[in-house]
Interface confidence: low
């Protein structure tokens, strides 16, 4: 693209099925030109997205794109839910689409929870 605007390449309706107890890296692909933006992760709770300030994050730089990574070490059952990354630069702020984690408890690793089960467990 000719535009030098920041882009957040999280696919709409993307999802990850992961196991509790495993390490996991949730990536926010970030495209920028000159100055790297300030990026944060938040977790959706109803209509609000709660900023994850006390979680380990890191940057991974690649040739054409960078990744702002939220680390889960290890994944916990209550990590179930939807996450969003946001970028702040100059006076602008953009938000990614949400990405959903479906966490399967190791006790029942053979069964992936349904979306309804996951939702009721998450919002309970």
């Amino acid at each position: 693209k000719e535009s030098c605007d920041v882009q957040l390449y999280i696919k709409r309706q993307s999802e990850h099925s992961i196991l509790a107890g495993d390490p996991f890296e949730l990536e926010c692909p970030v495209k920028y030109c000159a100055n790297r933006p300030h990026v944060t992760w938040c977790k959706l709770n109803g209509t609000t997205c709660v900023k994850l300030e006390d979680r380990q994050t890191s940057w991974k730089e690649e040739k054409n794109i960078s990744f702002f990574i939220l680390h889960f070490e290890p994944v916990l059952p209550n990590d179930n839910g939807s996450y969003r990354c946001s970028a702040n630069f100059q006076s602008n702020r953009i938000e990614s689409h949400s990405t959903t984690l479906y966490v399967t408890d190791v006790k029942s690793a053979s069964e992936r929870p349904s979306k309804d089960e996951m939702a009721s467990r998450f919002w309970a």
Epitope: S3, D5, Q7, L8, Y9, K11, R12
Partner: antibody
Amino acid sequence: EVQLQESGPSLVKPSQTLSLTCSVTGDSITSAYWNWIRKFPGNKLEYMGYISYSGSTYFNPSLKSRISITRNTSKNQYYLQLNSVTTEDTATYYCARSHYYGYYFDYWGHGTTLTVSS
Amino acid sequence: DIVLTQSPASLAVSLGQRATISCRASETIDSYGDSLMHWYQQKAGQPPKLLIYRASNLESGIPARFSGSGSRTDFTLTINPVEADDVATYYCQQTDEDPYTFGGGTKLEIK
């Protein structure tokens, strides 16, 4: 709900400048991308360009010497200006929003029909 | 520019049957491992309406009779079963590369 509405003249003389307005409700033009597309009488669709949430612009190279896209964030409007129009610019002009990821056009205006004729 | 060639230019399908529209790109559509190819429906006197985004994702509110498939240079829109309300012109669009381009359109009629 996001709504876009084009406004402007329906008839312009050759060599004059076309000015169109797209008024946006239900979303801020300081988010996403805001595009202009036109459809010619033969049904061909042509992408003209965009103004982004930050105010940066992109123009189709086929129009680059004649086109400008600007905005007024306080009015939540963006504008198309096309200079030196000819009869070849006769078309229906649409404004549309596209998303950060994928750039597909999820909301469109109803379109405004322009005839270039002396 | 990426040229999108749609075929057929028009087709007539019986109610309840399947309609298949093809879109072939002059270059690979594969930005960041994703196919930025989209499909729109345009009825007479109306603006285009998004049906499928990123090759195979159904836009919210669009009936599941519509589906998209394909990758790289060959993409397909399928309507199954066709209903009377589907009479329209269908366009593919790529947003993989500037300038964005549209296919020439496929006019769907009922037999």
